[in-house]
């Protein structure tokens, strides 16, 4: 058993049917010695007496809030959370994994050291999250994260809707122009009722870069059905742009065609590569769509920015 | 070609070649996170790789002040990787076909490092470690690690040359 925060303890339990359970000693935080009784929010009536209560924890009924009393007065509380281990593997039941098998998905719109991580939950009830740097070595990268918040968007996976939580983090000391040598390491602690789980992720900022879409897409008519399409770097992208350059993929989207945001990289069929911020295209109905990607490192592509082909004359 | 002393390299040529290096490095190992290579035993070969760090003057301001520190660092790295790509790590099994991007990558690393070598001026180069893993498994793992590391290195180098070509070319 270990202390998660004041008066909250995590009991690591072997979740196999014949496991003996964990023996836990709870000590009442009081100078008093006599006439102390114990209750649990999971069971009726008095469950023990004495300054120290010894219990065996093997199921969720054994978790929860334990309170010691004397003569009708509450002396102290100890909250027990269960961390299940089945066949040597810690449980991962609170979160739902994304398509690529990861539980935490982090993205950064630039190289500033600011990034956002998100995760999906199976049931949005009685949840608490805490995310922090997981590496304690002196040369590790320190990160400060805010509070997790529930996103407005729901995510559908395998025909089921999941709630999405997000958190913003910032690396304490950054050097956007350097080559990263140590990954950022994060741990997410998740609590749901009396269940505790932890999840971890490790990444370089360069691998989680996903630029915002190009902005200010515009059309200028040329001869025949040729148009010049132009755009600008997204505001959030690192500067100077002569150093932090983007490349762009341009595609004609036919009417009624959906633009797929693929996991498998940017260069979809029919898209062509442009390094400047304008190009000429043949455009007869539908949309012209542009997406951005770091010019020198193949991290994720931005979402598509699209503009209709018809040009107001 | 770069000229002696503290003068500038051919920024535009370096930009082109470094961008080609980026493309080749990704062709040689396109899969991001295809195995979590950080989990595997850290080989000294990948630990000793020269990195472009914060104090190396490869940021826009540092390049404006004196690009030589940064260029020297980049050249050291290019020579290091060029030696690795020519070693048994890449010539042994698993077999690479002659059309492999690794061959072109190897030649381009050499080409760019020569562009950065001032006439009659030889920067000291780092000692290249030469552990030769005996098993295909270890060799392949090391290959992937080296290529992932090279992708990060040449991305920074390409940014440096792009910025130099845009702002420091005569």
């Amino acid at each position: 058993m270990w202390e998660l925060e004041k008066d909250v303890y995590v009991v690591e339990v072997d979740w196999t049917p014949d496991a003996p359970g964990e023996t836990v000693n709870l000590t009442c935080d009081t100078p008093e010695e006599d006439d102390i009784t114990w209750t649990s929010d999971q069971r009726h009536g008095v469950i023990g007496s004495g300054k120290t209560l010894t219990i065996t924890v093997k199921e969720f009924l054994d978790a929860g809030q334990y309170t010691c009393h004397k003569g009708g007065e509450t002396l102290s509380h100890s909250h027990l959370l269960l961390h299940k281990k089945e066949n040597g593997i810690w449980s991962t039941e609170i979160l739902k994994n994304f398509k690529n098998k990861t539980f935490l998905k982090c993205e950064a719109p630039n190289y500033s050291g600011r990034f956002t991580c998100s995760w999906l939950v199976q049931r949005n009830m009685d949840l608490k999250f805490n995310i922090k740097s997981s590496s304690s070595s002196p040369d590790s990268r320190a990160v400060t994260c805010g509070m997790a918040s529930l996103s407005a968007e729901k995510v559908t996976l395998d025909q089921r809707d999941y709630e999405k939580y997000s958190v913003s983090c910032q690396e304490d000391v950054t050097c956007p122009t350097a080559e990263e040598t140590l990954p950022i390491e994060l741990a997410l602690e998740a609590r749901q009722q009396n269940k505790y789980e932890n999840y971890s992720t490790s990444f370089f900022i360069r691998d989680i870069i996903k630029p915002d879409p190009p902005k200010n897409l515009q059309m200028k008519p040329l001869k025949n059905s040729q148009v010049e399409v132009s755009w600008e770097y997204p505001d959030s992208w690192s500067t100077p742009h002569s150093y932090f350059s983007l490349k762009f993929f341009v595609r004609i989207q036919r009417k009624k065609e959906k633009m797929k945001e693929t996991e498998e990289g940017c260069n979809q069929k029919g898209a062509f590569l442009v390094e400047k911020t304008s190009t000429e295209v043949q455009c007869k109905g539908g949309n012209v769509c542009v997406q951005a990607q770091d010019r020198y490192y193949n991290s994720s592509c931005s979402k598509w920015a699209c503009v209709p082909c018809r040009v107001r004359s | 070609r770069a000229v002696p002393g503290g003068s500038s390299p051919a920024w535009a040529q370096c930009q082109q070649l470094s961008q080609k290096l980026c493309t080749l490095a990704w062709s040689a190992h396109p899969l991001v996170g295809h195995m979590d290579l950080r989990e595997e035993g850290d080989e000294e070969t990948t630990n000793d790789v020269p990195h472009i760090q914060c104090g190396d003057g490869c940021d826009p301001q540092g390049l404006r002040d004196n690009s030589q520190f940064c260029l020297q660092r980049i050249r050291q790295g290019l020579i290091f990787y060029e030696k690795l790509l020519g070693s048994d790590i890449f010539t042994g099994e698993p077999s690479l076909l002659p059309d492999s991007p690794v061959g072109q990558l190897h030649a381009s690393l050499l080409g760019l490092s020569q562009l950065l070598q001032p006439e009659g001026h030889h920067w000291e180069t780092q000692q290249i470690p030469s552990p030769s893993p005996s098993q295909p498994w270890q060799r392949l793992l090391l290959r992937f690690k080296i290529l992932r590391s090279l992708q990060a290195f040449v991305a920074v180098a390409a940014r440096v040359f792009a910025h130099g070509a845009a702002t420091l070319s005569p």
Partner: antibody, heavy 120, light 107 residues
Framework: QVQLVQSGAEVKKPGSSVKVSCKAS????????IHWMRQAPGQGLEWIGY????????KYNENFKGKVTITADKSTSTAYMELSSLRSEDTAVYYC?????????????WGQGTLVTVSS | DIQMTQSPSSLSASVGDRVTITCKAS??????VAWYQQKPGKVPKLLIY???TRHTGVPSRFSGSGSRTDFTLTISSLQPEDVADYFC?????????FGSGTKLEIK
């Protein structure tokens, strides 16, 4: 898109030779190796060898040395595989294929196959 | 030459079944193994490379695993269109070699 089109089926007498062609399109012919495999009726696949058209250098499976000659014609983007001193055991479907661009020999694109039958 | 010993040589399973085909290399090939599907009268089609990476467009019911000498192709839920021959292939060492194949049929 990448396409490999092979020549038609052949029936040959024992002791004779056959030359199978594989015309490539949809990519730069000199950029990639072209490999040849064979599959005898009801059997698995055997790798015969490859040619790298950029420098016309072939590499053979030792088991086929002296039996097979692989060549390439850059002007027509065509690879050839010639089998000599044919025997009944050479009856098989012969495939040309090109591998992935990363330089490892897993095969993404295959020709449609050419059946060579050796019979007296 | 590296021998790729594939088993079983044939198997019959019902739609929805989980099907496993194994391949054993006679020496270490790292993860330089690919799997192909060949339907009757058709050319082989790449399913898996690097032992476990699915090729573009291959349904997610196909998965590969293994390293060094022992490799597995798994079809998590057999579909009627999966009737075919399946081959493993090592591309670690010359000459590249293939398994003898597994003929998969529906019961």
């Amino acid at each position: 898109q990448v396409q490999l089109v092979q020549s038609g089926a052949e029936v040959k007498k024992p002791g004779s030779s056959v030359k199978v062609s594989c015309k490539a399109s949809g990519y730069t012919f000199t950029d990639q190796t072209i490999h040849w495999m064979r599959q005898a009726p009801g059997q698995g696949l055997e790798w015969i060898g490859y040619i790298y058209p950029r420098d016309d250098s072939p590499k053979y499976n030792e088991n086929f040395k002296g039996k097979v000659t692989i060549t390439a014609d850059k002007s027509t983007s065509t690879a050839y595989m010639e089998l000599s001193s044919l025997r009944s055991e050479d009856t098989a479907v012969y495939y040309c294929a090109i591998p992935d661009r990363s330089g490892y020999a897993w095969f993404i694109y295959w020709g449609q196959g050419t059946l060579v039958t050796v019979s007296s | 030459d590296i021998q790729m010993t594939q088993s079983p040589s044939s198997l019959s399973a019902s739609v929805g079944d989980r099907v496993t085909i194994t391949c054993k290399a006679s020496r270490d090939v790292a993860i330089a193994v690919a799997w192909y599907q060949q339907k009757p009268g058709k050319v082989p089609k790449l399913l898996i490379y690097w032992a476990s990476t699915r090729h573009t467009g291959v349904p997610s019911r196909f998965s590969g695993s293994g390293s060094r000498t022992d490799f597995t192709l798994t079809i998590s839920s057999l579909q009627p269109e999966d009737v075919a021959d399946y081959f493993c292939h090592q591309y670690s060492s010359y000459p590249f070699t293939f398994g003898s194949g597994t003929k998969l049929e529906i019961k």
